[in-house]
Amino acid sequence: MRRGPRSLRGRDAPAPTPCVPAECFDLLVRACVACGLLRTPRPKPAGASSPAPRTALQPQE
């Protein structure tokens, strides 16, 4: 669980998510898992003042 060295990147750097299609990167254990196993933030209501969050968990293209 989140063990070993990890390089720190700039805030806008892409998340290094070497996952196969249909898998997502679990940020909390730093591993690729089936996307359905992860719960994402609640969607913003329409017209919310805060922009939609940029996700680091989308499946690899």
Partner: antibody, heavy 117, light 111 residues
Amino acid sequence: EVQLQESGPSLVKPSQTLSLTCSVTGDSITRGYWNWIRKFPGNKLEFMGYINYSGTTYYNPSLKSRISITRDTSKNQYYLQLNSVTTEDTATYYCATPHTYGAMDYWGQGTTLTVSA
Amino acid sequence: DIVLTQSPVSLAVSLGQRATISCRASESVDDYGISFMHWYQQKPGQPPKLLIYRASDLESGIPARFSGSGSGTDFTLTINPVETDDVAIYYCQQTSKDPWTFGGGTKLEIK
């Protein structure tokens, strides 16, 4: 909407074992992370540990080998067991679930535990 | 463990004014281009409520009076303007490294 509800004793004697249950509705505990957090009388919050979608557990090292978190997926419940309690374990115990960044957006109402002889 | 130090410990602000709460981490909580820092509000007899996640993202349903900023080791929660309903204790939390930790809390009162 995910809902969590803690249940368990309100009073435990020193050296006994504390057992708490978190009952979850609105989502399956086979996805996501399922945490235990406690708040001490002085307002300090402590993350105790979690069990996740795969059944993997993580425990705060401050609790050493006293803690165990388990689950029953058929009941959609998860459990906290804390052994050898002392008066220092007097606190309000919460179950909570975070989203992908670890931010806990759903919490139970909390159950207050007093450890006293 | 990453230690989160909040300041001030308590804060009294006039209605309609700005409240600023600081959270300093003992080491960076940034990884993968993300700040793993979150803010909660807790009122007596209630569980904590998530306000801000990932340093600056407003949780769904939270008024835009609340905002978060910062990266690395220094983070700020701002409430502007402060309303009566904002009287509470505010906590920062990091989930960058095990074990996840919370700040000691900042108590907000109305002047």
